[in-house]
Interface confidence: low
């Protein structure tokens, strides 16, 4: 054990190069200085090292920097990047976009993982304020990371970024996110023909108000009943029933086996029974013939 | 022609609640393209951002303000408000109401302003 | 908070003559700045936005530039009516805090 500790004479590297990876674990520890180490992190990443000897290079690391890495250092630490924990990771003070985008690059193509989730959290502390540049690199490698944003935060994201977004980075996304989305979602993709502008829009439409729902209606979009459940409620009340069977076209009959849910069953509510009638589905619940319908807002406003 | 006009109490007593309305005409407060915005202005002083609201009610707050603020919208009346608590003499300001485009933070067309005075 | 500092807080030129007013960004804002002119007892007007572009009704003689955190507003031949204080703004932050310079007032010299 002893003779372990100590460097094999002719062995202490003189700098971080491939000949190291050659060396046994023990050796490693042993022969390469942290120091050394330190300032030609950028090498470690072009050197084919085996997981157990990163594991050695992070705890020389580690040893040198017991209080969380310099920014110099975490900027090169390419693949020992995924050695880190969230833990390690608290300790760093991230303030350079390069560095965050260096990092990302590691992980790009996986999921968001607690060591990426956690250097973002670190780089927005760090930075005390986010640019659009820096939000346009996180929503360039993570566009679902939108979803995990407030609405506040949210209120500050480039139209621009909105390209990168799939509509699975949405499903996680409530209402209220959707709101700010939606807006933007619309400014990005405005010089768009009207198919695919749809086929673009359709993701955020959980935004949409009613007067943009009633012009979809016009534009023979065919809307699923996925997308038709999600939207707000409150933009679904208004609708005709004429408007919402071009805006449906033929995914009109799926309103039947929906009828009970919402947004069908409170639309169904404010609807004429002799309007729903004509959709030949059997839709029951709409208001009888020959009742007065009252504006609701309007005696509001009256009384 | 898009009118904006302030109303609302011109003093309010230290400790209590600064309540504005804002009212929206000649054009359409649930427009997605605009956020309604509120700045104020000390007197002899320059202007602050307080926060904007969205048609839908999702409202964004100046962070040195959010404790004491709600902002807050209102389309059936084409109306949006401010209520600000726990006002002190540092709150007495010309109040403004304002539109924000969706696509920035700049707001280009304001209302005419009201000043409210903080006094006992 | 990103801080706006314009100078100079008083500028005094004659009518017909050129004003050149500045505006600085504790950090950078890109080109995420706007203008506005404000007269005695009245509200704010949007004069440029994004540096340099002019705002609906604002004549040729008002014209912006810069970029990150110095900005500048030029006008190139004052007019009685564009003595007043002029306010540069951000809003390039996110969060969204949008903040104001402490204003420059332009004065008939």
């Known amino acids: 054990e002893v003779e372990k500790t100590a460097c094999p004479s002719g062995k202490k590297a003189r700098e971080i190069d491939e000949s190291l990876i050659f060396y046994k674990k023990w050796e490693l520890e042993a022969c390469v200085d942290a120091a050394l180490l330190a300032t030609q992190m950028d090498r470690v990443n072009a050197i084919p090292f085996t997981y157990e000897q990163l594991d050695v290079l992070k705890h020389k690391l580690d040893e040198l920097y017991p209080q969380g890495y310099p920014e110099s250092v975490i900027q090169h630490l390419g693949y020992l990047f995924l050695k880190m924990s969230p833990e390690d990771i608290r300790k760093w003070n991230v303030t350079s976009l390069e560095t965050l985008k260096a990092l990302l690059e590691v992980n790009k193509g996986h999921e968001m993982s607690p060591q990426v989730a956690t250097l973002i959290d670190r780089f927005v502390k760090g930075r005390g304020q986010l640019d659009k540049d820096t939000l346009d690199t996180l929503t360039a490698f993570y566009p679902g990371y939108l979803c995990s944003l407030s609405p506040e935060e949210l209120s500050s994201v480039p139209p621009s970024s909105i390209w990168a977004v799939r509509p699975q980075d949405l499903d996680t996304c409530d209402p209220r996110q959707l709101d700010v989305l939606y807006p933007k979602a619309r400014l990005a993709f405005q010089n768009m023909n009207g198919s695919e502008y749809f086929v673009k829009i359709q993701s955020f439409l959980g935004g949409a108000p009613t007067e943009d729902l009633k012009a979809l209606s016009q534009q023979n979009v065919s809307m699923d009943l996925a997308t038709f459940m999600k939207l707000r409620t409150d933009a679904v009340l208004p609708l005709t029933v004429a408007e919402v069977q071009k805006l449906l076209g033929p995914h009109v009959e799926g309103l039947k086996a929906e009828e009970r849910h919402r947004p069908v069953r409170d639309w169904i509510l404010r609807q004429r029974q002799d309007d729903l009638d004509t959709l030949g589905l059997g839709l029951q619940g709409g208001i009888p013939n020959g009742y007065l319908v009252l504006d609701l807002s309007m005696q509001e406003a009256l009384s | 022609q898009l009118q904006l006009q302030e109303s609302g109490p011109g003093l309010v007593k230290p400790s209590e609640t600064l309540s504005l309305t804002c009212t929206v005409s000649g054009g359409s407060i649930s427009s997605s393209s605009y956020y309604w915005g509120w700045i104020r202005q000390p007197p002899g002083k320059g202007l602050e951002w307080i926060g904007s609201v969205y048609y839908s009610g999702s409202a964004f707050y100046s962070p040195s303000l959010k404790s004491r603020l709600n902002i807050a919208v209102d389309t059936s009346k084409k109306q949006f408000s401010l209520k600000l608590s726990s006002v002190t003499a540092a709150d007495t300001a010309v109040y403004y109401c304002?539109?924000?485009?969706?696509?920035?933070?700049?707001?280009?067309?304001w209302g005419q302003g009201t000043l409210v005075t903080v006094s006992s | 908070e990103i801080v706006m500092t314009q100078s100079p807080a008083t500028l005094s030129v004659s009518p017909g003559e050129r004003a050149t007013l500045s505006c600085r960004a504790s950090?950078?804002?890109?080109?995420?700045l706007a203008w506005y002119l404000q007269k005695p007892g009245q509200a704010p007007r949007l004069l440029i936005y994004?540096?340099?572009t002019r705002a609906t009704g604002i004549p040729a003689r008002f014209s912006g530039s810069g970029s990150g955190t110095e900005f500048t507003l030029t006008i190139s031949s004052l007019q009685s009516e564009d003595f007043a204080v002029y306010y540069c703004q951000q809003y390039n932050t996110w969060p969204p805090e949008y903040t104001f310079g402490q204003g420059t007032k332009l004065e008939i010299k």
């Open positions: 994004g540096t340099s």
């Open positions: 950090q950078s804002v890109s080109s995420n």
């Open positions: 304002a539109r924000r485009p969706y696509k920035s933070g700049l707001f280009d067309f």
